[in-house]
Each structure stands twice: as C-alpha cells, then as structure tokens.
Amino acid sequence: HNTTVFQGVEGQSLQVSCPYDSMKHWGRRKAWCRQLGEKGPCQRVVSTHNLWLLSFLRRRNGSTAITDDTLGGTLTITLRNLQPHDAGFYQCQSLHGSEADTLRKVLVEVLADPLDHRDAGDLWVPGESESFEDAHVEHSISRSLLEGEIPFPPTS
C-alpha cells in the first residue's frame, strides 16, 4: 500500500476518506487505527457500528468519528479540533473475524503557522494578539506517497 497524506489545519476538523470495493468488503465492519511505530501494532481508535447494516451511523471516540457508506464504498473518518499530537501514521481497515485488511495507509499532517508554537516571549518579531477561534471544517488536502517515503519522526 502507498501512503496517502492528509493535511489539516490545527484546531479545525480534518476528513479522511478511504475508498474500497463495496462488493469485496460486503458485510464487513471497518476500523480506524493508529500505527504505533514503523513495525508496531495498529492501535484501534474507533470502529463502525456493531451491526453492519447500521454502518452509516456515525460512531465517535473522543474527537474521532467514523461513518461508512457501504453502498458507495467510502469509509470516512473525521478528526475534530485537530492537534499536533494527532499527527502520525494511521490505517483504514476492513474487519473479518479476528483479521483486518488494510484499505488505506494514511499520514496525518497537522498544519499551523510556524510562529504559533513559540512561547509569547520567544517571538523575535513583535507578537500580535490572537484572534477568534473559528470552527469551519478544513477540506483535507491529500497526496500519495511511495511506501516508506516519509520516515517516522525520531522520538526524543
């Protein structure tokens, strides 16, 4: 699987879409998981409704929601109030028994103005007062990467 990059602005909502063959995955529940390390397990974040026929109903775990268009073959994950710690590698999965097929590998990038993450006293240029928080949904930007093209950031 190639990795698809989805970019969302910090504080906004990011929609990740995972297309799949609706016939091949007929009757299967879906899940969104976070990859823990390059070779580590994929930790389940949220999965679709226990009853496959109700997969269109939005299920939520914290700030992450999932819904499945089983006829159209599109799994949609929404990350609300995107934060820097949301950045990283994820997978969309199709579940069958205790097994899981990968539908798409995803890299979430959280966008912010580079000055946002300096302490107020760290701005070399005079700081302006922060403005209102708006809540519109960020229409995600996505692009494909070759497998392994972006390494995991080093841990400190």
Epitope: D113, W124, P153
Partner: antibody, heavy 114, light 112 residues
Framework: EVQLVESGGGLVQPGGSLKLSCATS????????MHWVRQASGKGLEWIAH??????????YYAESVKGRFTISRDDSKTTIYLQMNSLKTEDTAVYYC?????WGQGTTVTVSS | DVVMTQSPLSLPVTPGEPASISCRSS???????????LYWYLQKPGQSPQLLIY???NLASGVPDRFSGSGSGTDFTLKISRVEAEDVGVYYC?????????FGQGTKVEIK
C-alpha cells in the same frame, strides 16, 4: 544579537554527499521550528526542509525534490541544525540558507559538478 | 502544492512615490486562530532575505513603517507608502501553512 551561520558547502561530484551545519545564537533555539531554504543562481527561493521542536517529536518535512536524499536534524544542546545531503544532483547547486523564518543566515554555496 | 503568484514580476519605481506588489495563493492561508500565514521578504542584492511582514499584516521588528501588508485569505498586497533608494531588491511572498511551503516567483523592484 541573533546569529545564524551556515557552513559545510563546497564543490562535490554528482552522486556525492555533503553535510551542512547552521550554528545559531541569540534566540531560544529549542522552541523554534527551523528550516533550510535554497536559491539557485539568479533564481527564486525554494523551501526544502523543516524540523519542528522537541515538543513536536522533532517532526521533519521535506520538499519532493529532496525527499529520500536529504535529512534535516537538530542538536538543541549545540543550538545547531544540519542538512545531510546524499545522492547529490547538478540541480542541487545553490546557496543554502538556514532560517527560523524571521532571521536568516548568510548562506553557504553548494556546487554539484563533475 | 499551494501556488503563490506574484505580480508584477518587475516594478520600476520613483523615490518618494508609492508602490504596490500583489500576491495570490491557490488556497486560503487562514488558520483556525484567525491568523493568515502569509509572509513578505525582501532580498537586497547580494544579501540574504529579510522578513518584512509576517502573518499578512504584521510589521517585523526593525522594518520601517512605510511598509504595510494587507489582504484576504488568498489575495495579498504589500505596499510601500514612499519608496526609498534602499528598498530596491527582489520581494517574495511566501506561505508557511501547507506542506510543502512555497514562495512566489519574486518581484524585482528597481529605481527608474
């Protein structure tokens, strides 16, 4: 006084490697996202790499033109950033600047030629 | 990639007269904090770029107040109220929100 001083540029053959350094002082380096930007002779500015702070797990980002060949890193204890450049191509010939976006170094020249 | 388009690419100016440079981005640069991540730089001949305006309209430290920045989420303008001889060089707009970060092609300002 804020200072950013690049070094490590020079002449290298295609396929070769170079490591650029950027020593900084005069600002709280560890909190600042740092970048490398290059400029070919007579051309415009091209952003090529970016490294975030420790609080962001030193996340790195690259322009497609250098991805897989260049590696940005930082040493907060030395307030220095680096750019390891491998598999160099003639089109990598440029002046390389390090920057925190508000202040810039004077640049170091990299020439890739046989 | 976000495309930054500047106009004009060359701008002959008369000292003491106003001057204006436009920059358009192919997508909005407005963040959730109401900040617009648009920056303006001046690169004087033989020098490194220097920051003039950050976040669309904020004057960087040490920059004369004859410079000002304005705009919306996608259309931006750098204005010089009264051009001085030291203002010659290449002006670049840049977006630092979406990866990869991108610069405009540059506008060369020279004295008539």
């Amino acid at each position: 006084e804020v200072q950013l001083v690049e070094s490590g540029g020079g002449l290298v053959q295609p396929g070769g490697s170079l490591k650029l350094s950027c020593a900084t002082s005069g600002f709280p380096f560890s909190n600042v996202w740092m970048h490398w930007v290059r400029q070919a002779s007579g051309k415009g500015l091209e952003w090529i790499a970016h490294i975030k702070a420790k609080s962001d797990n030193y996340a790195t980002y690259y322009a497609e033109s250098v991805k897989g060949r260049f590696t940005i890193s930082r040493d907060d204890s030395k307030t220095t950033i680096y750019l390891q450049m491998n598999s160099l191509k003639t089109e990598d010939t440029a002046v390389y600047y390090c920057t925190g976006l508000d202040y810039w170094g004077q640049g170091t020249t990299v020439t890739v030629s046989s | 990639d976000v495309v930054m388009t500047q106009s004009p690419l060359s701008l002959p100016v008369t000292p003491g007269e106003p001057a204006s440079i436009s920059c358009r981005s192919s997508r909005s640069l407005l963040t959730s904090k109401g900040i617009t991540s648009l920056y303006w730089y001046l690169q004087k001949p033989g020098q490194s770029p220097q920051l003039l305006i950050y976040r669309m309209s904020n004057l960087a430290s040490g920059v004369p107040d004859r410079f000002s920045g304005s705009g919306s989420g996608t259309d931006f303008t750098l204005k010089i109220s009264r051009v001085e001889a030291e203002d010659v060089g290449v002006y670049y707009c840049a977006q630092f929100l979406v990866y990869p970060y991108t610069f405009g092609q540059g506008t060369k300002v020279e004295i008539k």
